[in-house]
């Protein structure tokens, strides 16, 4: 229930967050599950624990395994598991599928590629970006905060993009790389007031308590490439990031698709371990562009799992 997969490359920094939640003030102890050996907190160690974070500085293939984190609240100790796999660096340029983060899509005027997991690290701009192992050069490429913007995207821009940055820990620098695929949808067209295809207005979505649930906000904005089009989720009228519930997260970046020639965006809201309290919230799918904003509201209802008796 409280388990998470993480991966990295040998000789790079890897930072993993405990899948079990808790207040920042809570002590978190980490153990290597196979041996039940405590992970030290002293930063002089190559692998050490720092609150909710487990740091491999740098990582080694032998570090692979399951790590247990115990969040010590004032009442109970709460346990989570991090399944860590460290891979050897490839000698050739190909990045294997098991090292790839989720694919993102873009178009001529919507070409952000986010650098995965970067928020866990202590890094300073700018990021370095590579496409198919070649450093990106030229004015079309702009590294902005934690993402890459490509101006005047062309179909040839599709490929595997790697972000590389330096994690700094007590004056020591460690390299981190993360790779994801970028696909291009390029069309000329027109722009319309946003049309939300899903969810339907005032839709009731049935969810099972204790299970994970996904809500997709999908909207179309016209034909071809779109300028300043976005979809996002709000909870009780508040941005997901400001709502402060780590179990409820938007999928990083926006996936672009083309439906019957229309340019559409979708944003997935992931709710982990659905709780009864989630049914009380108002979920708003927002679609906006230069023409204006449209909002569809969803509420969750409890789906009682069917009991199967022999």
């Amino acid at each position: 229930k409280f388990s998470k997969q993480s991966w990295g490359l040998e000789n790079e920094a890897l930072i993993v967050r405990c899948p079990r939640q808790g207040k920042p003030s809570y002590t978190v102890d980490w153990y290597y599950s196979q041996t039940n050996k405590s992970i030290p907190t002293q930063e002089r160690n190559r692998v050490f624990a720092s609150g909710q974070l487990l740091k491999f500085l740098p990582a080694a293939v032998a570090d692979s395994g399951i790590y247990t984190c115990i969040v010590r609240s004032p009442t109970f100790n709460r346990t989570g598991y991090a399944n860590v796999t460290i891979y050897k660096k490839q000698s050739d340029c190909n990045v294997p599928d098991y090292l790839m983060y989720s694919t993102v899509s873009g178009s001529e005027k919507n070409s952000k590629i986010y650098c995965p997991t970067i928020d866990l690290y202590n890094w300073t701009a700018p990021l370095e970006w590579f496409k198919n192992c070649q450093a990106l050069q030229g004015s079309r490429y702009r590294a902005h905060k934690s993402f890459l913007v490509i101006d005047n995207v062309m179909t040839e821009d599709a490929g595997d993009y790697t972000c590389k940055f330096i994690h700094n820990e007590n004056g020591a620098n460690y390299s981190v790389t993360a790779t994801r695929s970028f696909t291009v949808k390029d069309e000329q067209g027109f722009s319309l007031f946003p049309v939300i295809g899903a969810p339907a207005q005032n839709e009731i979505k049935e969810v099972e308590i204790g299970k994970n649930a996904n809500l997709t906000c999908s909207a179309c904005f016209g034909k071809g490439t779109q300028f300043l089009a976005a979809v996002l989720w709000q909870l009780n009228g508040t941005k997901i990031t400001d709502f402060g519930e780590p179990r409820i997260q938007q999928e990083e970046g926006q996936n672009q698709s083309f439906s019957n020639g229309l340019a559409c965006l979708d944003m997935v809201l992931r709710i982990a371990d659905v709780k009864e309290e989630d049914l009380l919230l108002q979920y708003d799918c927002l679609a906006l562009n230069l023409h204006g904003l449209r909002r569809h509201t969803v509420r969750l209802s409890r789906k009682n799992p069917i009991d199967h008796h022999s």
């Epitope: 808790g22 207040k23 920042p24 609240s73 004032p74 009442t75 519930e245 179990r247």
Partner: antibody, heavy 121, light 106 residues
Framework: QVQLVQSGAEVKKPGASVKVSCKAS????????MHWVRQAPGQGLEWMGT????????VYNQKFKGRVTMTADRSTSTVYMELSSLRSEDTAVYYC??????????????WGQGTMVTVSS | EIVMTQSPATLSLSPGERATLSCSAS?????MHWYQQKPGQAPRRLIY???KLASGIPARFSGSGSGTDYTLTISSLEPEDAAVYYC?????????FGGGTKVEIK
């Protein structure tokens, strides 16, 4: 919706024991620790302890240690609080209560209706 | 244990006035929760994690503070706000409540 329904009022003699029940519904019972808080007439709130229904683990306020026992029955989604060696100062309303999101200990969001326990000779 | 001291014990104000309730902890705590209790009812969570408004609570209630000193503010009192208000810490075992502040509406 989340509901905590407690057993009815009790009148006990000094030295006796009382067992108060709290039946939970509207959420997965093992997902949230259950706490017990009491309130003497005209007085403030006092935390007695908590139980993790998943493991049966308990944490008690030292003040009640040795006298209080909290248990959970997963088959009926019910927690129990038993207080022994009752004295007149144990006369109070006893509440079961739980946090909104368990891991974040974000205050007691849900409360039972309370059970009045009167200790009198 | 951490002792929570609330002041004043009683606050008597007119509708529309601003109410400021204080809670002082004997040792620094990370967060404070606030509850409202009316006669014959169970307490109701108002503010959690120092400043977050609980679901269904009017925006006239707000919380602030850090360390040992915390405040619950009711910006403009309504007649239905007459109640006893409790602060509570969840930083240390045993969890403890303040003695309460009674708010009376003139």
């Amino acid at each position: 919706q989340v509901q905590l329904v407690q057993s009815g009022a009790e009148v006990k003699k000094p030295g006796a024991s009382v067992k108060v029940s709290c039946k939970a519904s509207g959420y997965r019972f093992t997902d949230s620790e259950m706490h017990w808080v009491r309130q003497a007439p005209g007085q403030g709130l006092e935390w007695m302890g908590t139980i993790d229904p998943e493991t049966g683990g308990t944490v008690y306020n030292q003040k009640f240690k040795g006298r209080v026992t909290m248990t959970a029955d997963r088959s009926t989604s019910t927690v129990y609080m038993e207080l022994s060696s009752l004295r007149s100062e144990d006369t109070a309303v006893y509440y079961c209560t739980r946090a909104f999101y368990n891991d974040f200990d974000d205050g007691f969001a849900y409360w039972g209706q309370g059970t009045m326990v009167t200790v009198s000779s | 244990e951490i002792v929570m001291t609330q002041s004043p014990a009683t606050l008597s104000l007119s509708p529309g006035e601003r109410a400021t309730l204080s809670c002082s902890a004997s040792t620094s705590v990370s967060y404070m929760h606030w509850y409202q209790q009316k006669p014959g009812q169970a307490p109701r969570r108002l503010i959690y994690d120092t400043s977050k408004l609980a679901s269904g609570i009017p925006a006239r209630f707000s919380g602030s503070g850090s360390g040992t000193d915390y405040t619950l503010t009711i910006s403009s009192l309504e007649p239905e706000d007459a109640a006893v208000y409790y602060c509570q810490q969840w930083s240390s075992n045993p969890l403890t409540f303040g003695g309460g502040t009674k708010v009376e509406i003139k």
